[in-house]
């Protein structure tokens, strides 16, 4: 019989092997680090480890053998929180709980692994886990006056408790108190994600900006990163569900072929090849820069036109380790004479996925490891914030405060966690005994919210799609969904009449100084002038007869008392009882790819900011036209708000970004927009009991 082909293993330059500690040395180090022994170096005799191992096994709910068995070794090798299980980091000041309920936090630094708004959102949701079951509130501030300072750091990062590189120790936090006490630190040598691989936002396509789902299947093949397969225009795309072949949901990935960032090229895509200092470039380059940022020209000749932009980076192909950490995979690349258009484990005996960071590994030997599933920043943060509130580790494996990392999508709090936090702070006044599933389950950062579930697919970037080979994503239908029938409320009061029972409102708007909450053809008015007053429900059809019963957003221009209503790609404008519309959004100067207005925020001089998902335009309220040159990304103006907000409005000089049951409130502070509060729409805006 023919011999089975033996795999070829290759020596990769700068391939750092894992530690050569023996199992006993590893255990000794672990037992000391996490508080089970006093002395770091013991005699090395197995007997001397026995009491400490028994204590460890009890704490982690493992079989109590007192031996360094396989299950114990597996636990020792698992990623975990860096806070000791026995005792504290050290003796601390005070009684290790906060003595005020309005806790503040400052995000001092960020990781590059996730977009900043996803990081902000992950932390806000992690705090919401605890505020949902306590009387505590958490407000974001900007500076060292914060109770809890959040930092990403590597190795020795300013507290005497160094991190350990990738995996192992993920994060640590200190119990409540002044200075470093209460602070939470995250190891930036980890890949931070939402627990299911690199987070890559999508643009256009038909998935409402949902992030890529890795792996996804296309034409029967599995993809762990964005691909240009099936297209001939070089634009990378991905499936946003596990099976593109079945679901046909997709979006375009950040790419210099789609857009550029910052620079002066108005966000246009790169033009390849382009001329710079007399040389031709057919890819993004770092030439002419000392900071290593990749850039390109957005016309064919930079020397002549001086139009440029930075090339977007993509988390799914940004490598770690190897000899090119921080660089991006180049696909296809040549390895041992063969072409690869996705990460591979070929040439490695450990099965780890890697890629080349130039088009030819054989020639250049430049490589790195491809991203793994990463660690859920939300789950790790929720755990660390438990420490920052005064909780110790739990020995219940299902508890959030168990020291080992375990990814799951269920509500993270266990009865043991709730019992512990209630012991410190008492019960919350909120009726929901647990944070809602959207807080707990790892949400995909741009999954369409409930109210947008019937949104039509977005069109391609301006210029129309390049005709793709069969099977490649194609744009979907563009018509707005038909409006449901508008129902008059029944005479008797039903639970449906109570806005506190509404999960997610269609839209919220400030009209004549009162907040209007719209849902399924009805609305409620809420005013907090002279005591909280709630009126309604009223029928939209009675107040504004020409308007469909459903809407995405509403906005009042108070000067001429005009009210703008938006539903998908259409707009209605009411002045008193007269109505103009429906008008198509492209009449406002928006491209045909804009199929939703999330909201308008008033600005001085008869202007407003018009927001559509992750983009913003300046809008002239009088001419009802956008300035097409003014388009910018949401996170350039409003860092820290959800990029998948389904409704945006202004109320009492603050902007509100709604996602699911929550709102992010933004105030203008020190010349920048800053999120100063994250809370429930019903409990906190509507003042529901």
């Amino acid at each position: 019989a023919p011999h089975q082909r033996q795999p070829t293993y290759v020596v990769f330059p700068r391939d750092l092997k894992t530690s050569n500690l023996t199992d006993t040395q590893l255990a000794e180090d672990y037992l000391y680090r996490y508080g089970y022994t006093r002395a770091a170096q013991m005699m090395g005799e197995k007997q001397s480890l026995r009491p400490a191992l028994l204590m460890l096994q009890k704490q982690l709910s493992l079989p109590q053998t007192g031996e360094l068995d396989s299950e114990t070794l597996k636990a020792i090798r698992s990623p975990r929180c860096g806070v000791p299980d026995v005792g504290k980091f050290q003796t601390f000041d005070g009684d290790l709980k906060w003595h005020h309920h309005n806790i503040t936090y400052w995000i001092q630094s960020y990781t590059e692994d996730l977009p900043r708004d996803v990081i902000d959102d992950s932390f806000a949701r992690a705090f919401a886990v605890w505020s949902a079951v306590t009387p505590l509130t958490f407000t974001r501030v900007y500076g060292l006056e914060a109770d809890i300072v959040i930092q990403f750091g590597v190795a020795e990062h300013g507290d005497g408790y160094p991190f350990d590189g990738k995996d192992g120790l993920l994060a640590h936090a200190f119990p409540p108190g002044p200075g470093i006490q209460g602070d939470a630190h995250f190891d930036d040598d980890e890949l931070w994600s939402l627990g299911k691989g690199a987070v890559v936002p999508t643009y256009f396509g038909n998935a409402n900006g949902a992030p890529c789902h890795f792996p996804f299947t296309f034409e029967g093949r599995s993809y762990l990163s964005c691909t240009t397969d099936g297209r001939n225009d070089g634009k990378p795309w991905c499936g946003t569900t596990a099976d593109y072949d079945t679901d046909r949901k997709y979006g375009f990935c950040p790419s210099e072929n789609l857009y550029t960032e910052h620079g002066n090229g108005d966000g246009k895509p790169c033009v390849f090849p382009f001329i710079f200092e007399g040389h031709s470039y057919s890819a993004c380059t770092t030439k002419g820069r000392s900071d290593g940022y990749r850039w390109c020209a957005t016309t064919a000749n930079y020397d002549q036109d001086k139009a440029d932009g930075f090339c977007p980076t993509r988390a799914d192909v940004t490598v770690t380790g190897g000899n090119s950490a921080g660089e991006m995979c180049v696909f296809p690349f040549v390895f041992l004479g063969k072409q690869y258009s996705t990460c591979t484990s070929e040439g490695r005996s450990d099965g780890r996925l890697w890629c080349a960071t130039t088009s030819n590994f054989d020639a250049d030997k430049k490589w790195g490891f491809c991203p793994d599933q990463g660690y859920s920043l939300f789950l790790v943060a929720a755990h660390e914030f438990g420490h920052a509130l005064g909780l110790d580790h739990s020995s219940v494996p299902e508890a959030l405060m168990y020291p080992m990392y375990h990814y799951h999508e269920d509500s993270p709090l266990h009865e043991d966690d709730i019992k512990g936090i209630h012991h410190l702070y008492g019960r919350g006044s909120k009726p929901d005994p647990r944070p809602p599933a959207t807080t707990a389950a790892e949400p995909q950062p741009t999954a369409p919210p409930t109210m947008c579930s019937t949104a039509p697919p977005m069109a391609y970037p301006t210029g129309g799609p390049t005709v793709a080979p069969t099977g490649a994503p194609s744009p979907g239908p563009t018509g707005p969904p038909t409006a449901g029938p508008s129902e008059a409320p029944t005479e008797s009061s039903t639970p449906d009449d109570n806005p506190c029972n509404v999960d997610v409102f269609d839209a919220i708007a400030d009209i004549q100084g009162a907040l209007h909450f719209f849902k399924d053809g009805r609305y409620w008015k809420f005013s907090n002038h002279g005591g909280n007053q709630l009126q309604g429900p009223f029928l939209i059809a009675r107040t504004w007869p020409a308007f469909p019963s459903k809407l995405n957003s509403a906005f009042e221009d108070p000067q001429p008392k005009k009210i703008f209503f938006f539903l998908w790609a259409q707009m209605w404008v009411y002045t008193g009882q007269s109505v103009l519309g429906p008008r198509s959004l492209d009449k406002l100067g928006l491209g045909s790819e804009v199929t939703l207005v999330t909201g308008l925020l008033p600005r001085r001089g008869g202007k407003a900011l018009l927001i559509s998902r992750e983009r913003i335009w300046k809008f002239d309220l009088k001419s009802q036209k956008v300035d097409p040159q003014s388009v910018t990304r949401l996170d350039n103006e409003f860092s820290g708000v959800p990029w998948n907000s389904h409704n945006v409005f202004q109320y009492q000089d603050k902007a509100y970004f709604c996602h699911d049951k929550y709102f992010w409130r933004v105030s203008f502070h020190n010349r920048v927009n800053q999120v100063d509060h994250v809370a429930y729409v019903t409990y906190d805006l509507l003042q529901c009991p």
């Epitope: 980091f89 050290q90 003796t91 601390f92 000041d93 001092q108 630094s109 060292l144 300072v149 590597v154 190795a155 020795e156 990062h157 300013g158 507290d159 005497g160 408790y161 108190g177 002044p178 200075g179 470093i180 006490q181």
Partner: antibody, heavy 115, light 107 residues
């Protein structure tokens, strides 16, 4: 209010050792790290080392072999010990509280190395 | 060790002028840069932490910016009392290191 005060010998003979005590008030050494910085006459600032809240230390690599920092949390005191002094160790020695920057400094103690 | 380079040892300016002092790190230090002011015969005073945050009580004419390797400290309208030496410092990786200092002179 927060205060740090260094006390040292003033004059040290070459090859002898230096001991400086930094006494702090208004905060706990369990909540903030303390750094040591020196400044030779007419020159810039040179970072010497730090003792963190848990007692671990980091040192300037060039001085590590002759530098040691310790503390007594209960007495709110931090100690700097430096061996084998030479004339170029003449400087003002400062202790400073650290929290994302050295936000409070002592007034400094002048040390002259001379025979 | 990370080297922090302040390219100007001296800068001369007039009252009311805007002045910027630069500091370059030999490797990426993210936003972990602090700026200190030291007046003759006094201890240094923390003005800016985390690259761009003003310490409590620091007048808002003092601002900081930058991330990675390039940092800038700006006084928007110089006052006579701003005569001092200004130091940058990184606290990303130990050993923490200071820049050589920039002496601001008032014309």
């Amino acid at each position: 209010q927060v205060q740090l005060k260094e006390s040292g010998p003033g004059l040290v003979a070459p090859s002898q050792s230096l001991s400086i005590t930094c006494t702090v008030s208004g905060f706990s050494l369990l909540s903030y790290g303390v750094h040591w910085v020196r400044q030779p006459p007419g020159k810039g600032l040179e970072w010497l080392g730090v003792i963190w809240t848990g007692g671990t230390t980091n040192y300037n690599s060039a001085l590590m072999s002759r530098l040691s920092i310790s503390k007594d949390d209960s007495k709110s005191q931090v100690f700097l010990k430096m061996n084998s002094l030479q004339t170029d160790d003449t400087a003002i020695y400062y202790c400073a509280r650290y929290y994302y920057g050295m936000d409070y400094w002592g007034q400094g103690t002048s040390v002259t190395v001379s025979s | 060790d990370i080297v922090m380079t302040q390219s100007h040892k001296f800068m001369s300016t007039s009252v009311g002028d805007r002045v910027s002092i630069t500091c370059k790190a030999s490797q990426d230090v993210r936003n972990t840069v602090a700026w200190y002011q030291q007046k003759t015969g006094q201890s240094p005073k923390l003005l800016i932490y985390s690259s761009s945050y003003r310490n409590t009580g620091v007048p808002d004419r003092f601002t900081g910016s930058g991330s990675g390797t390039d940092f800038t400290f700006t006084i928007s309208s110089v006052q006579a009392e701003d005569l001092a030496v200004y130091f940058c410092q990184q606290h990303y990786i130990t050993p923490y290191t200071f820049g050589g200092g920039t002496k601001l002179e008032i014309k």
